[in-house]
Structures are given as structure tokens and as C-alpha cells.
Interface confidence: low
């Protein structure tokens, strides 16, 4: 699997986990049909993907979730992919809204984020939600990766 | 195209296809804008992309579909990307799920999905749709593809 | 961040940018967290990005709007990737399809397009959508990339 | 890292049944596709019952549908596959799996000789 000593392949795919934190950042765990290549990018608290290599890397998210317009606030879901840098606040780098559904109880629907940044070693990425209490948690509905290019 | 004679490129991009069959499994095919690097990944009977060696690869797809609320079981519908390795059941890698439209005759939604995940030799990746009737096959609604990294 | 001499890496993100262009070919521009990794990929005009090597290209787009039924045409918000190569008609690669939300003044949705293509020297991306004015220019909400395999 | 132990093998004459066991130290079942694979002298190894213990999706092979059941005890740790109405076919060493970062992790197997 290697691209050579120097440059071993780094990349990572965490599924997500239901949680009772009320934070709205998304918790995940190596588990299922996860990916962790190596200790070069390490799951840190459950919450968020920390890599130890600059470099350029291609980012992913998936969410799922169940909501309906009347249960919900007027404000869309929103899914936030976010980065925190070492010594620098947090940043959004990318991020996707749905409005709710009219559908009753609830209606499913999946956002998908992804694009390439540059990460410095010792940052981390996470993805944030409006109402972490909406996300699916059923098999392949809601996860999150990276990949180094 | 090549990384070396060891370590070819790997990667394929094919388009949906129209098909009779009542099956939930989408078809391919190598037509329009397609991708086939090589022979170290194939599209066969038309539905599976298999790669020959083993790694981490990237593995996308994207389904364009045309539902109504009324006219649709009220499941809603669902992407599913699956895995099938040899001498091993079929597994999902990612779901995606979105709550039928309530615009007539029908309301078009898309879904992507992707991740990174490790393929042994000789695995093949298909996708499975709830109702293979509602997705849409005009020029680049469709589509379902995968690379090495 | 190179992989060799000959053999640099190539990947670009670039921002969306609102437009009182009529056009329905999405702005872009290099701010906030983007990337542009060296010159063998430029963003043209603000519009397109161009690659000055062969081969084969992970291109993707996300795109945020709001709409709201009533206020659209009939015709669902689709967004379109394209490609221009040098000598030849432009061709679609890529397109999503949303349904325009009932929820007033209007309703957030995202799309997310992304695959492998072969992009030759001098080739463009870009893409299109039916409303730009329905799109939404938030700190991450819109975003188009590419990366060289 | 998951260790894996089956145990409950042995000689059983057709039309018996015997029921496997396989102990999981390490890490908990949770949320892993756990499965019984078989390899018969000779043969290609081959998947025989595998559960998601996720949402408790089943899968069984063919040859085996209504004859085995899969199932789990999560607080013990521990999978199981009960085997009735075996066939002289069914004899094989079983092996359980953990399906884990995209390959299984395998137990050391347990002989089964279904024989008269």
C-alpha cells in the first residue's frame, strides 16, 4: 500500500456514532466498514480527523438526516465541514443546506460535501450540524473521510 | 497516464443506462464521457465495477431520480453503494436517502456519494436503488465510478 | 508537496462569487480558503479552470441555491459541469437536478457533482446553472475543484 | 486489536446439530459485521452467515438457509451459529470473522465432521 517510505498513503473513512452530547459537532467511530491507513491521521475524541503531514488533501462528509418543517426551526439543516489549525481559530471550509421537509413524521434527506485544501500537521477537521438529533444513523448513511493526494 | 509499470493509474467513470431488467441494481455502461484507465478495473454484465488489485480507493456515484409523494410507496428513496468480495456477502459501504417530492408529475432530486475504502482483489462495487424506474439517464444525471489512490 | 520533477501535484478549490452577469456560467474567485497549487491549473476569467497537462482529473462542484416553486419556472434548478477542450464543442460531464422547495421565500438545497475524467492540455471546466441568481454565496455553501490523479 | 476463539467443533452424525461459539476479546462487536466463514478440503473458503450487528441485518449462503442461525450476545462479547440438520457436506473447518478496516480478522477455526 505503500507509495514509498517517504510518501506512505494517508486516508481515512469513520462512520458515524449516535451520541447524548448536545454539541453539534458530529461524533464518529472506526468501526463497520471504516478506513484508518495509518497513524498519520489518527480519530481524536470521536470527533475529528487529525492529520500529522502537510499537504494537500481531498475532504469528504456525508450526512443523512430525518426532519420535518413544522417540528423544526425556520432555518434550514445546515452540515459545516470545519477546520482547526493549530494556534488558529476554527474555520468553515465548506458547508450545505437542506430545508426541511414537509414530509410526516420526518423526511430523509443526504447532503454530501467534498473538496481539496491544504492542511498544516496537527490540524484536524470536523463536521458541525444545526440539530445533531436529526442525523441517520443507520448503516452507510452518515460519514466522513479524507484522503492525502 | 503512468505512475510507474508497478503502479499504474487506476480509475473508471461510466454512465447509466436504461434497462428492462426489474432488478434494484443500477446498469453501466462505457459510453459518452466515460472512463476505463485499464484492465485493472472492468465494468461486468454491464452493473459492477471489479478491480483486480488490491488498495484504497476512492469510489463515487451519483443518482438523479424523478419521484412523487402520491405515486410512491412512502419508503423514501435510497442510493445504496455496495461491495461484494469474493467468497463474501454483499455489504453496504454508503446509503443515501431522499424523501420523495411533492411536485407533479414528479419532482427530480440527486444524490452523491462517496468514499474511501479498501478493496481486495477481484471485489466489485455495485449500486442498488429502492425503485430503478424513477432515476433519470439524460446526459450526466447518472453516473458511478472509482480510483485508486 | 511534490511527488517528483515531473510529476507535480495539480489541484485547485476555488470560491463562488456572486455575478450581476446574466450568464448562466458560475463566478469563482481565489479567496477565503481555496487552493490553487501551482500553474499547470489557472482559474480563466473567473470562470473556468484550466489544466495545462493530460490525464485524468477528479473535477467536482458544489452548488447551494434557494428557490421557491411558486416564484421558478416550472423546469427544476439543475446545475451543470462542463468541459471545453481546445478545437471541440463544449460537452456536459456531470448534472444534478433539484425541485424548487415549497417553503417561502424560499428553500435552501445542495448539490454535489463530482467524477473522473481525461482532461487534455489546454482543456477548461466549469459550470453552469439554470438560476444563478437563486444561488447562495455564504462562506462555504459554493465551491468547485479539481485534482490530478 | 480483536482477538477471536471458536470453539464447539466436533464429530456430529448427519441430521445432528452443534452449535459454535466464537469469543471476542479486545474490542466489542459493536456496530461490526461479524460472520462464520467455512473451508472445506480442498475448497475456497466461504462465507456462511454473517450478521450487521449494527441493525442485526442477516445473511446466509444458500446451502445453508433455514438449517443455520446466527446471532450474538453483545454483553458476552460473543457470536454464535447454530448448525441443524447437518450434511456430510457441511463438513469444514469454521472460522469466525470480524469484518474490520477492510478485511476480516480471523479466528484460529474449529473443526466440524459431520460423519456416520
Known amino acids: 500500500m505503500q507509495k514509498g517510505d517517504q510518501n506512505p498513503q494517508i486516508a481515512a473513512h469513520v462512520i458515524s456514532e449516535a451520541s447524548s452530547k448536545t454539541t453539534s459537532v458530529l461524533q464518529w467511530a472506526e468501526k463497520g466498514y471504516y478506513t484508518m491507513s495509518n497513524n498519520l491521521v489518527t480519530l481524536e475524541n470521536g470527533k475529528q480527523l487529525t492529520v500529522k503531514r502537510q499537504g494537500l488533501y481531498y475532504i469528504y462528509a456525508q450526512v443523512t438526516f430525518c426532519s420535518n418543517r413544522e417540528a423544526s426551526s425556520q432555518a434550514p439543516f445546515i452540515a459545516s465541514l470545519c477546520l482547526k489549525s493549530p494556534g488558529r481559530f476554527e474555520r468553515i471550509l465548506l458547508r450545505a443546506a437542506n430545508t426541511h421537509s414537509s414530509a410526516k413524521p420526518c423526511g430523509q434527506q443526504s447532503i454530501h460535501l467534498g473538496g481539496v485544501f491544504e492542511l498544516q500537521p496537527g490540524a484536524s477537521v470536523f463536521v458541525n450540524v444545526t440539530d445533531p438529533s436529526q442525523v441517520s444513523h443507520g448503516t452507510g448513511f452518515t460519514s466522513f473521510g479524507l484522503l492525502k493526494l | 497516464m503512468q505512475k510507474g509499470d508497478q503502479n499504474p493509474q487506476i480509475a473508471a467513470h461510466v454512465i447509466s443506462e436504461a434497462s428492462s431488467k426489474t432488478t434494484s441494481v443500477l446498469q453501466w455502461a462505457e459510453k459518452g464521457y466515460y472512463t476505463m484507465s485499464n484492465n485493472l478495473v472492468t465494468l461486468e454484465n454491464g452493473k459492477q465495477l471489479t478491480v483486480k488489485r488490491q488498495g484504497l480507493y476512492y469510489i463515487y456515484a451519483q443518482v438523479t431520480f424523478c419521484s412523487n409523494r402520491e405515486a410512491s410507496s412512502q419508503a423514501p428513496f435510497i442510493a445504496s453503494l455496495c461491495l461484494k468480495s469474493p467468497g463474501r456477502f454483499e455489504r453496504i459501504l454508503l446509503r443515501a436517502a431522499n424523501t420523495h417530492s411533492s411536485a407533479k408529475p414528479c419532482g427530480q432530486q440527486s444524490i452523491h456519494l462517496g468514499g474511501v475504502f479498501e478493496l481486495q482483489p477481484g471485489a466489485s462495487v455495485f449500486v442498488n436503488v429502492t425503485d430503478p424506474s424513477q432515476v433519470s439517464h439524460g446526459t450526466g444525471f447518472t453516473s458511478f465510478g472509482l480510483l485508486k489512490l | 508537496m511534490q511527488k517528483g520533477d515531473q510529476n507535480p501535484q495539480i489541484a485547485a478549490h476555488v470560491i463562488s462569487e456572486a455575478s450581476s452577469k446574466t450568464t448562466s456560467v458560475l463566478q469563482w474567485a481565489e479567496k477565503g480558503y481555496y487552493t490553487m497549487s501551482n500553474n499547470l491549473v489557472t482559474l480563466e476569467n473567473g470562470k473556468q479552470l484550466t489544466v495545462k497537462r493530460q490525464g485524468l482529473y477528479y473535477i467536482y462542484a458544489q452548488v447551494t441555491f434557494c428557490s421557491n416553486r411558486e416564484a421558478s419556472s416550472q423546469a427544476p434548478f439543475i446545475a451543470s459541469l462542463c468541459l471545453k477542450s481546445p478545437g471541440r464543442f463544449e460537452r456536459i460531464l456531470l448534472r444534478a437536478a433539484n425541485t424548487h422547495s415549497s417553503a417561502k421565500p424560499c428553500g435552501q438545497q445542495s448539490i454535489h457533482l463530482g467524477g473522473v475524467f481525461e482532461l487534455q492540455p489546454g482543456a477548461s471546466v466549469f459550470v453552469n446553472v439554470t438560476d444563478p441568481s437563486q444561488v447562495s454565496h455564504g462562506t462555504g455553501f459554493t465551491s468547485f475543484g479539481l485534482l490530478k490523479l | 486489536e480483536v482477538q477471536l476463539v471458536e470453539s464447539g467443533g466436533g464429530l456430529v452424525q448427519p441430521g445432528g446439530s452443534l452449535r459454535l461459539s466464537c469469543a471476542a476479546s479486545?474490542?466489542?462487536?459493536?456496530?461490526?459485521?461479524m460472520g462464520w466463514f467455512r473451508q472445506a478440503p480442498g475448497k475456497e473458503r466461504e462465507e456462511v452467515a454473517t450478521?450487521?450487528?449494527?441493525?442485526?441485518?442477516?445473511y446466509y449462503a444458500d446451502s445453508v438457509k433455514g438449517r443455520f442461525t446466527i446471532s450474538a450476545d453483545n454483553s458476552k462479547n460473543t457470536a454464535y451459529l447454530q448448525m441443524n440438520s447437518l450434511k456430510p457436506e457441511d463438513t469444514a473447518v469454521y472460522y469466525c470473522?470480524?469484518?474490520?478496516?477492510?478485511?476480516?480478522?480471523w479466528g484460529q477455526g474449529t473443526l466440524v465432521t459431520v460423519s456416520s
Open positions: 470473522a470480524a469484518w474490520l478496516n477492510g478485511g476480516n480478522r
Open positions: 479486545g474490542r466489542t462487536f459493536s456496530s461490526y459485521y
Open positions: 450478521f450487521y450487528t449494527g441493525d442485526g441485518r442477516t
